[in-house]
């Protein structure tokens, strides 16, 4: 858990941080795990430690090894270990396995491929980028912060990725590359007429008076994000904002849920403090979208309390 | 949503031992350090200590120290703070609290609702 | 142990009036500060971390800063609901230590 998997090029930046985290303004110390011998703080030095990030500028080969941080908080100490690879420049354009990122998947609708690592170096736009070594040209590809977005994707645009940016340190430029599969997905969303799936058509809730109660609308419109979906819960026909009882309120905000791939909202009703009079209401659960509204309708019912005999 | 439920109040008598608890639910237990306080009106809030669930490893007020045994229970998500040799100076509300150490907020960022223990003969 | 000197101990004030604590370090705790409010019957909550960071949903009107011993949250419009006791803390250092407490009452 505590243990973490780092690599690069020789000659490239490359900057680790540690697997065990703490605040800012915690204390970390690094080690060279092999020797123990402290890596020095000094931007002088090409390998140097800054804070929670240890940096190789620029890697070499002979770096490769494990490194131990240390997070040091007023009351713990927190042991991390870095697994550094470095590796020698391929000659060809293969980008070996051992040097890829994890892959990413893409659709029509969402094409975003990130740049790894990014986030930990000091660098400024823009991002070259490389499909299996060619340089990305074309109104298509726009590399846009720290990933690139694919216009109308297809299925041939599946492929290795590669970003390349300079990172920037006192005034020193230092190059990085870093490889990750893109994998294409077929997306074909739908949208159909509303499936209500929560609570049945006529169903009675039982309730206690003076308790509070929830009652979940919940509905299915297709597959995929749909273009105008809602759900929401009426009171004898009327919605529940001008029904004017602060006791009924509807939870704020819709969730949004993908069960089995199909693009679900619910909408609870939260009734505080039962009184008699809610018995008499009618509670309609409405699903709306593009082909229509299906309502179901809940009535409740008094629950008799349990006796318990000895 | 991130709750801590602590145990009930209680009354226990000088010299004896107290056993509090505290239920953590809605968080991943073991990434947060769980923290004690304890609250009198006259001294305020005072700091008991902290666990850190993923190891067990506690670091303890001097003040305290000897006296409160912090532990906890990945399996229940459940911390516990033992006091021993209880003298009416121990008669307080006592929370727990998850300290957020590796993202913001860091700090205190949940409490549990306390626990009252009074000491009397 | 850091001591945390918390001043005023009692704020009278009136809706609408700016409020300011001090809490004063008895050495340097950076910037890990924190505030704490609690109301009558309630546990403390966090209002304000890394001496000027405002947590999550609390209202803009509350606001801390300061850095090294000397540090200062202010309530900008103070309202009815801000009536509570107010806490520093430094997580700088172990033993964690806490001031002694501000109590706000609103005339």
């Known amino acids: 858990k505590f243990s973490k998997q780092s690599w690069g090029l020789e000659n490239e930046a490359l900057i680790v941080r540690c697997p065990r985290q703490g605040k800012p303004s915690y204390t970390v110390d690094w080690y060279y795990s092999q020797t123990n011998k402290s890596i020095p703080t000094q931007e002088r030095n090409r390998v140097f430690a800054s804070g929670q990030l240890l940096k190789f500028l620029p890697a070499a080969v002979a770096d490769s090894g494990i490194y131990t941080c240390i997070v040091r908080s007023p009351t713990f100490n927190r042991t991390g270990y870095a697994n550094v690879t470095i590796y020698k420049k391929q000659s060809d354009c293969n980008v070996p396995d051992y040097l890829m990122y994890s892959t990413v998947s893409g659709s029509e609708k969402n094409s975003k491929i990130y740049c790894p690592t990014i986030d930990l170096y000091n660098w400024t736009a823009p991002l070259e980028w490389f499909k299996n070594c060619q340089a990305l040209q074309g109104s298509r590809y726009r590399a846009h912060k720290s990933f690139l977005v694919i216009d109308n994707v297809m299925t041939e645009d599946a492929g290795d990725y590669t970003c390349k940016f300079i990172h920037n340190e006192n005034g020193a430029n230092y190059s990085v590359t870093a490889t990750r599969s893109f994998t294409v997905k077929d997306e074909q969303g739908f949208s159909l007429f509303p499936v209500i799936g929560a609570p049945a058509q006529n169903e009675i809730k039982e309730v206690e008076i003076g308790k509070n109660a929830n009652l979940t609308c919940s509905a299915c419109f297709g597959k995929g994000t749909q273009f105008l979906a809602a759900v929401l819960w009426q009171l004898n026909g009327t919605k529940i904002t001008d029904f004017g009882e602060p006791r009924i309120q509807q939870e704020e905000g819709q969730n949004q849920s993908f069960s089995n791939g199909l693009a679900c909202l619910d909408m609870v009703l939260r009734i505080a403090d039962v009184k008699e009079e809610d018995l008499l209401l009618q509670y309609d659960c409405l699903a709306l979208n593009l082909h229509g509204l299906r309502r179901h309708t809940v009535r409740l019912s008094r629950k008799n309390p349990i006796d318990h005999h000895s | 949503q991130v709750q801590l439920q602590q145990s009930g109040a209680e009354l226990v008598r000088p010299g004896a031992s107290v056993t509090l608890s505290c239920k953590a639910s809605g968080y991943t237990f073991t990434d947060y350090e769980m923290h004690w306080v304890k609250q009198t009106p006259v001294h305020g809030l005072d700091w008991i200590g902290t666990?850190?669930?993923?190891?067990?490893?506690?670091a303890y007020n001097q003040k305290f120290k000897g006296r409160a045994t912090l532990t906890a229970d990945k399996s229940s998500s459940t911390a516990y703070m033992e006091l021993s040799s209880l003298t009416s100076e121990d008669s307080a509300v006592y929370y727990c609290?998850?300290?957020?150490?590796?993202?913001?907020?860091?700090?205190?960022?949940?409490w549990g609702q306390g626990t009252s223990v009074t000491v009397s003969s | 142990d850091v001591v945390m000197t918390q001043t005023p101990k009692f704020l009278l004030v009136s809706a609408g009036d700016r409020v300011t604590i001090t809490c004063k370090a008895s050495?340097?705790?950076?910037?890990?500060v924190a505030w704490y409010q609690q109301k009558p019957g309630q546990s403390p909550k966090l209002l304000i971390y890394?001496?000027?960071n405002r947590y999550t949903g609390v209202p803009d009107r509350f606001t801390g800063s300061g850095y090294g011993t000397d540090f200062t949250f202010t309530i900008n419009t103070v309202q009815a609901e801000d009536l509570a006791v107010y806490f520093c803390q430094q997580d700088y250092s172990s033993p964690y230590t806490f001031g002694g407490g501000t109590k706000l009452e609103i005339k």
């Open positions: 609290t998850r300290y957020s150490y590796t993202n913001s907020p860091y700090g205190m960022d949940y």
């Open positions: 890394y001496a000027s």
């Open positions: 050495q340097s705790v950076s910037n890990d």
């Open positions: 666990i850190d669930p993923e190891t067990g490893d506690t």
